[in-house]
């Protein structure tokens, strides 16, 4: 808490300006109109100000709106952001996805803190739903942002959204966000052919039902290893060796590789030992 | 094509347990990724309740989880809503929705009409 001193004559700003970094803590504070800062907001992030200077202009902010700074103030925080606690952040109302991008640019290369998980919350609770564009301006700063959300977040993404996702997007997804996932990805790509449909769909089928990868194993779409690993084991478990060998192709060899590994260990105790062999992989179950 | 109809009172008293089905017609919903409600408050939007996934998983709207059981019945091609300890911040249209298609080369969402429930004494 900085003490409440008169300005010096003379030291009055009557702009945010350079001058002002040579001003002490007290002299900001006795001398810079919180009215003029908010106005000139824009003007803060290309002055040096030391941190203990940024800490007295966010108390002079604090002091002109108690119930939570307006967006026109927000969006030009900058760096006095890296100031807010997630307790001021809750005060606020950001509707403008610009206002968001401004703010986390700020915070960019850094993980995601307190104050960037409590913005996003704010925003995408104000605006409903985490629509296509937000989806979009989040993963880009956060690929792993999709699969830090709850499955219960997830179902209020439409299905539209699916089309931002990157397959790095769901890369620490488990297999209870990709249940919520999946079936908005097949709504959202059905409508493309077989093998486009299989390229977007293929980060998602860690939701698949086994009647989903059974329908899979008839179009020819050899499913890598790696997908093939992240599959529900519920869902492997039902699938015949004729039905694993289409659905993987060329890929089948790398079975053996991953024998004693889920799901492909499961899978091949529930196999009987002569549809194995035709594989010819040397697997035992 | 499915057909999903909500069926229950309309009229429910606070701190009772309000009780809807979803009868659905024209297919089996074994053929559904999940089963789902939501309800919109008179003058709101749309508010997520809770939803059964194919998985067996169950996921609830977490301010309303501890008052939500939703289950399903595949062989009645019913499922149903319990929401207990109501209030009038309840008093909502309810839908039931569904998205089926699981095993087939095409997926759709379906929504019942809706029905209101009032709850007041």
């Known amino acids: 808490e900085v003490e409440k001193t008169a300005c010096p004559s003379g030291k009055k700003a009557r702009e945010i300006d350079e001058s002002l970094i040579f001003y002490k803590k007290w002299e900001l504070e006795a001398c810079v109109d919180a009215a003029l800062l908010a106005t000139q907001m824009d003007r803060v992030n290309a002055i040096p100000f030391t941190y203990e200077q940024l800490d007295v202009l966010k108390h002079k902010l604090d002091e002109l709106y108690p119930q939570g700074y307006p967006e026109s103030v927000i969006q030009h925080l900058g760096y006095l952001f890296l100031k807010m606690s997630p307790e001021d952040i809750r005060k606020w109302n950001v509707t403008s996805l610009e206002t968001l991008k401004a703010l986390l640019e700020v915070n960019k290369g850094h993980e995601m803190s307190p104050q960037v998980a409590t913005l996003i919350d704010r925003f995408v609770k104000g605006r409903g739903q985490l629509d296509k564009d937000t989806l979009d301006t989040l993963t880009a700063f956060y690929p792993g942002y999709l699969c830090s959300l709850s499955p219960e977040e997830l179902s209020s993404v439409p299905p539209s959204s699916i089309w931002a996702v990157r397959p790095q997007d769901l890369d620490t997804c488990d297999p209870r966000q990709l249940d919520v996932l999946y079936p908005k990805a097949r709504l959202a790509f059905q409508n493309m052919n077989g093998s486009e449909y299989f390229v977007k769909i293929q980060s998602f089928l860690g939701g698949a039902p086994t009647e989903d990868l059974k329908a899979l194993s008839q179009q020819n779409v050899s499913m890598d290893l790696a997908t093939f690993m992240k599959l529900r084991t519920d869902a492997v478990l039902p699938l015949t060796v004729a039905e694993v060998q289409k659905l993987l192709g060329p890929h089948v060899e790398g079975l053996k590789a991953e024998e004693r590994h889920r799901p492909v260990r499961d899978w091949i105790l529930r196999q009987r030992q002569d549809d194995l062999d035709t594989l010819g992989l040397g697997l035992q179950g | 094509q499915l057909q999903l109809q909500e069926s229950g009172p309309g009229l429910v008293k606070p701190s009772e347990t309000l009780s809807l089905t979803c009868t659905v017609s024209?297919?089996?919903?074994?053929?559904?990724?999940?089963w789902g409600w939501i309800r919109q408050p008179p003058g709101k939007g749309l508010e997520w309740i809770g939803s059964?996934?194919?998985?067996?998983?169950?996921y609830y709207n977490p301010s309303l989880k501890s008052r939500v059981t939703i289950s399903v019945d595949t062989s009645k091609n019913q499922f149903s809503l319990k929401l207990s300890s109501v209030t009038a911040a309840d008093t909502a249209v309810y839908y039931c929705?569904?998205?089926?298609?699981?095993?087939?080369?095409?997926?759709?969402?379906?929504w019942g009409q809706g029905t209101l429930v009032t709850v007041s004494s």
């Open positions: 929705t569904t998205q089926n298609g699981v095993g087939a080369t095409t997926t759709e969402e379906y």
């Open positions: 024209g297919g089996s919903i074994s053929n559904s990724y999940y």
């Open positions: 059964i996934y194919h998985s067996g998983n169950t």
